[in-house]
Every structure is written in C-alpha cells, then in structure tokens.
C-alpha cells in the first residue's frame, strides 16, 4: 500500500506577525459572494486560502498568496531572494500522486520525481496530499525550478472542478428547465458582473441530485436546476437569494440608473 508522508502535525513557532491585523481571524463578512482570498493564520504561521463574502471583513485579507506572505511573514522577501540561487524543493514535491478519497474530476498538476517534471493528473476533490497544484506554472515554480521554499499549506488548496469536454455551450433546455429564448436577451457588454454568471447551468459529473440555482442572463433571474455533486461551473448557488446577490448586480438595466441593486 502506498502510505503518504504525514502532513498533519506541524510544530508551531513563536513568530510575531509584522502587523497587528495579521493576527486577526479570517473574516468572510456578511455578504454571500465566493471570492477566493488569503489570510495569515496566526496558529500555523502560514498564509492560507479562505472564501470572502465580498463585503466588510477585516484587513487580514489578501488577493494573492504572495501579497499575504510579503505583508505578514517576517523576512519573507529576504529569504525569497536569498534562496533564489540554490533553493531546495519542499518535501511534499516528492509525495506520490494521491487522487484522494472523493471522485469529483479536477484537473491538477503534480511533480513527478521520476521524470523530474510537473505533470497533469485527475484529483478527486477531497483530501489527497500537498503534491497537488492548480496550475502547471505553480507546480513548476515550487517543485521544478524552486525560487524559494514556500510556506507549505496544511492541505491541498481547492480550486474549480475540471469540466474538460463537459461544459454545456448552447442549449435551450437545461435539466428539463426550458430557458426562454427572449428577444430582450441582454448583450454580454450590457452585463458588468461576474463572468461566471454568463455561463449556462451545468449539472456536473457525479450522481447525486442536489437542488441548486443558476443565473440566467437572458431572463435576469435565478432558476433552479439539479446538480450532481461535482464538476460543473461557478454559476451554481445553494440558494436563490445567494444567486441573485452574486449575479443580479452586474446587469445594467438603464445607463442613467446604473447598476440594479
């Protein structure tokens, strides 16, 4: 049996953060958007991903992992420069491929120690190990040509499910819902919201039947559809309210009135 190196217990140092706000807890705020952000975790002394709701929250929130590290990890930039000459690969680059316990289908990349290259693999969507990257570029940076040893995260960072060959492009019926082909369809340039709100409903790749809502840019409304539990796209919300909040704001009804609230 293939046993993975343990990556669950780590020694905690007594490092002081650079700014007081780095010690704040991650705060997703009261709104319901799902924006991938990063925060500094005082307990693990690492920058970690969290989902930001889109409003309020606190200062311990960064758009990129790099920005979070630069702001909150003492000496991060210095060690990055110092290590650039001859950096070692993090231990997790040598872990064997682990698709994880679940069976969603996500396109990921891992470092193959045999070929000394980053390669694509299919990740199941939960657990697994840290030799698991969202992009080829990220894998190469960290494991093929490490510029600096990154602060390892506790678990795999999740990203959107792979939908290769499974994205619905143009159909008038989605999961038995007839999508009205209205003559008043807003043109794409009239929509200033999140791009995924323009995607068609996609029921995904698995076998469950979960009630979800998608935004129909033709009607300006959120409609119900059946989600199979994995795969699909970001036009997928657990409630109609959350769907409307996330997508309705981007529809420009009238140039003088501005954005619909």
């Amino acid at each position: 049996l293939s046993e993975e190196a343990d990556d669950t217990d780590s020694e905690l140092g007594s490092m002081k953060p650079l700014h007081t706000f780095c010690a704040m807890k991650a705060d997703d705020g009261p709104c319901k958007a799902m924006i991938r952000s990063y925060f500094f975790n005082m307990y693990t002394h690492q920058c970690e991903e969290f989902i930001y709701g889109g409003c309020e929250g606190n200062e311990n929130r960064f758009d990129t992992l790099e920005e979070c590290k630069k702001t909150c990890i003492p000496g991060y930039e210095k060690t990055a420069v110092k290590a650039a000459s001859g950096a070692e690969r993090p231990d997790f680059c040598f872990l064997e491929e682990d698709p994880g316990l679940c069976r969603g289908y996500m396109k990921r990349y891992l470092y193959n120690n045999q070929t000394k290259q980053c390669e694509r693999f299919v990740y199941g969507g939960c657990l697994g190990n840290r030799n698991n990257f969202e992009t080829l570029d990220e894998c190469k940076k960290i494991c093929e040509n490490p510029v600096h040893s990154p602060s390892p995260v506790n678990e795999v960072q999740m990203s959107d499910y792979v939908t290769d060959g499974n994205t619905v492009t143009d159909r008038s019926t989605v999961n038995n819902i007839v999508v009205p082909q209205s003559p008043k369809v807003p043109r794409r340039r009239d929509y200033r919201g999140r791009p995924w709100c323009l995607q068609p409903a996609d029921s995904g790749l698995c076998k469950a039947s979960e009630r979800r809502f998608y935004y129909n840019s033709a009607t300006g409304k959120c409609h119900r559809f059946n989600y199979t539990g994995c795969g699909g796209n970001n036009n997928n919300f657990t409630t109609r309210r959350r769907c409307l909040r996330s997508c309705k704001t981007g529809l420009i009804k009238n140039k003088s009135k501005g954005v619909v609230k």
Partner: antibody, heavy 123, light 112 residues
C-alpha cells in the same frame, strides 16, 4: 444493499495485537468509488477515526497520527474484506470498533457501517 | 487537526416540536459553489451511526425531510422540523476538509 460484517476477539491482553476483520457484501473492496475505514468509539474520546484504505490506480492508505506507529489496515481482495491490526495495545485502546464504507461517488461520507465490536484490553 | 465543537451536548425535546444542533469547526470547511465538507450522523441507542446529511445540506437516501442541514464556513446547524420519538440518539458532525477526519463530541437528543 451494502453490508459490513465485523469479526474478531472481544478481549485482548495489554501489549498484544488487536486484530479485526470486516467482510463486505454488496460492494467490492477494490471499488474505485469507495474507501474503507476503521473508526472507534469510547466514552472518553467519542468517535475517533483511525485510518482508511482505497484503491484507485493503486492502493492508498492514510492513518491517524495518534495510532500511526501501531496501525495497519489491509485489503484482502480474494475474500472481499479488509482488516485492522493495532499493535502494542493498552487499556486506552478499549473501545467499540467500527468498520465503515466511505462513498466516494455520491455522498462523500460514511454511508455504511459494520455492527461494531467491543474490544476490551485487559489482562 | 480540525476541532469540531457541538452544542448543546444534551438536548431534551418534545415530540412535534422543532430542535436544532450547532456544530462549529476550528477551520473553514467551505469548498467551491457553496459546498461544505461537513456531514451529520445519527447514532440511535444500541446501533451503529448512520449518515443523515452530506456536504453540509444534502439528505442521504431514506432520510426524512424533517431533517435539514445548513451553514457555511465554520458554523453549521442541523434542524429537525418536528421531532419524532424515533429521532432520539446521539448526533455527530464530521469534517473531511483535511486529515485526520474528525467528529464532534456528539449531542444527545432525548424525549422530555
């Protein structure tokens, strides 16, 4: 309908090895849409996950750090079962032991459980 | 390890009345599209646990619709709209965001 049938001794002496088996019917231990786990329950510690095995392109396992140095979970494909071995037991290992199936396709959860085996560690 | 904390630990209920159990995790369990890596189980007296709710809010096969799961991130709730006598037992939440898989300490639901 998946059924998990546990077997093994209810009494084990301290320092010896606890061995339990879980026979599967209605599914295969080699299924790529399942994973197979051992979980124990004691009054002091509640439900405690011990480890899991699963077959994808090959076999994988993961163990809880608390028992990692003492535990082995193995599949037996010929008998369609899997086993738990816990070495060097102490009275602290006294608990009800459950085998369980993790549904990897639909539920993403432990959707079938064995009947439980009370194991007492005592001399 | 992700610590799962349930409250209350004991919940006396009246048949026909609603009941609510809270589960809080020490780290966010949210994934994409509002999926939360959290399950709920019920262990009836003298039985093995059974899966009630998966991915935070989806009822497992054969689970009555009086059971519902909600919440996101670190705060989750299991609600029983109208408690029936057969609902007594210990309810557990469980996370699968990271190893080790961890359970809450349980909430014992009993009839008043």
């Amino acid at each position: 309908q998946v059924q998990l049938q546990q077997s093994g001794p209810g009494l084990v002496k301290p320092s010896q090895t606890l061995s339990l088996t879980c026979a599967i019917s209605g599914d295969s231990v080699s299924s790529d849409s399942a994973a197979w786990s051992w979980i124990r329950q004691s009054p002091g510690r509640g439900l405690e996950w011990l480890g899991i095995i699963y077959k994808r392109s090959k076999w994988y396992n993961r163990y809880a750090v608390s028992v990692k140095s003492r535990i082995t979970i193995n599949p037996d494909t010929s008998k369609n079962q899997f086993s738990l071995q816990l070495n060097s037991v102490t009275p602290e290992d006294t608990a009800v032991y459950y085998c369980a199936r993790w549904h990897s396709d639909k539920h993403w959860g432990f959707d079938d459980w064995g009947q439980g085996t009370l194991v007492t560690v005592s001399s | 390890d992700i610590v799962m904390t349930q409250s209350p630990l004991s919940l006396p209920v009246t048949p026909g009345e609603p009941a609510s159990i809270s589960c809080r995790s020490s780290q966010s369990l949210v994934f994409r599209f509002g999926i939360n890596y959290l399950n709920w189980y019920l262990q009836k007296p003298g039985q093995s646990p059974q899966l009630l709710i998966y991915k935070g809010s989806n009822r497992a096969s054969g689970v009555p619709d009086r059971f519902s799961g909600s919440g996101s991130g670190t705060d989750f709730t299991l609600k029983i709209s109208r408690v029936e006598a057969e609902d007594v037992g210990v309810y557990y939440c469980q996370q699968y965001t990271s190893y080790p898989l961890t359970f809450g300490q349980g909430t014992k639901v009993e009839i008043k």
